[in-house]
């Protein structure tokens, strides 16, 4: 099959900016330039080095990351937001997504939580201080919004298959996920559906066909009855907390 990119990702992530010309492989169905994970000769080709990924909202980042402007010392163009490592407990935060899994943002500090019941991107209301370099931390800040299209876009949330810029463009039960050259509204994963748990930083983000995250009250975990030779390829599904 020529559906030769990694498609079972629930980490909705963008690609790095272009690095050069088209980089095809003999036998590949399409040339994607550059750095896109695709199959050539039955082997996945990918970037070896970890690079920051641009993002417009937290949902485009992995479960252990959030979307924000990089610090002054970090690589990146001014004004561009990238996926940053989540903040551990007792670190400062502005919203729940900034805190690492198992924590949530309370009074501007990441605190341990028994239940990850807060939607990603929700802004912690009690925070009043500006978090240093995280001046653009609120999801979606400073990003272009649809203002010049037909009236349909002003009044209706995107349905399945509608183009989106961020998940707030989509109707309830849908998220904004990449599908090849666009981002479209796709269904949030339900209990029992396959998801992907990314173990290493930089091991995700190159998917060009992406799944949504698991729905509310669900977590992406190893399927208990799924036995495979390789630990790294064990099936993950959305399961109740």
């Amino acid at each position: 099959t020529l559906n030769s990119v990694l498609i079972n990702s629930n980490a909705i992530k963008n690609l790095p900016p272009p690095l050069g010309g088209a980089g095809g492989q003999p036998g590949s169905a399409v040339s994607v330039a550059p750095g896109v994970l695709y199959e050539g000769g039955n082997k996945y080709q990918t970037l070896d080095n970890y690079q920051p990924y641009p993002c417009a909202e937290d949902e485009e980042c992995g479960s252990d990351e959030y979307c924000s402007s990089p610090s002054r010392g970090a690589a990146g163009v001014g004004g561009v937001q990238i996926c940053l490592a989540c903040r551990k407990r007792r670190k400062r935060c502005m919203r729940h997504a900034m805190c690492c899994p198992g924590n949530y943002c309370k009074n501007g500090i990441c605190m341990p939580s028994d239940h990850s019941h807060f939607p990603r991107g929700e802004i912690e209301e009690s925070i009043i201080e500006n978090l240093g370099n995280d001046h653009n931390a609120a999801a979606g800040d400073g990003y272009p919004r649809r203002t010049t299209l037909t009236s349909k876009i002003y009044h209706t949330k995107g349905q399945e298959g509608s183009v989106c810029l961020r998940s707030s463009d989509c109707a309830a039960g849908l998220c904004c996920a990449r599908h090849f050259w666009s981002k479209i509204c796709k269904p949030v994963l339900k209990e029992g559906q396959v998801c992907t748990k990314h173990k290493r930083k930089g091991s995700h983000g190159l998917e060009i066909f992406q799944r949504c995250y698991c729905g509310e009250g669900l977590a992406c975990r190893i399927q208990k009855d799924h036995h495979q030779a390789s630990n790294s390829s064990r099936l993950h599904t959305c399961q109740r907390h």
Epitope: V5, L15, V163, P187
Partner: antibody, heavy 120, light 111 residues
Amino acid sequence: EVQLVESGGGLVQPGGSLRLSCAASGFTFSSYAISWVRQAPGKGLEWVASVSGTGLGFQTYYPDSVKGRFTISRDNAKNSLYLQMNSLRAEDTAVYYCATSLENYAFDYWGQGTTVTVSS
Amino acid sequence: EIVLTQSPATLSLSPGERATLSCRASESVDDFGISFINWYQQKPGQAPRLLIYAGSKQGSGIPARFSGSGSGTDFTLTISSLEPEDFAVYYCQQLKEVPPTFGGGTKVEIK
């Protein structure tokens, strides 16, 4: 109103080059993917190239049939899309359309097309 | 690549009749809970026009007489009652996999 206007088509000899342009208006050009689709005389539609929008890093995409010969690019300041076509062949003769995906994951807005004829 | 086969190649009907156009994919075009099939209408000398996306959803400004159905590999475009302006060529397209592909088209002509 969304508008896409192609230009730059014409007659060129095999092995020659041509650069097509597509002027866009009526939408936030940089935010959205935009593509080239062609149609040979009396034939069906064929996807030629695409470039993603700002949120996806302006990635470019090609089918094997044009890879290495055609280059898609965009100038967001000018709201313009381009297709640089090199090493042209007789089978590249077609009407070339630029099309974009603004509302739906499909080519929901199209230009009127520009004709490219490759012949000696 | 995914091959789309449209049938019939030509459909001869009269205004007011119901048109049923078929598009069959060489493999499933469903993924992520979405059918990645689109339908376009093209008239001579004009650019294609999007009718249906995601298998069954109507594009902007498309009359209700146009509807799409199907899943997996078999899809149908139905025009409930043909209007004079509906006589044209219709193409299906898949956007599930790369490269995107189009069917060969069905010409709907006046009987």
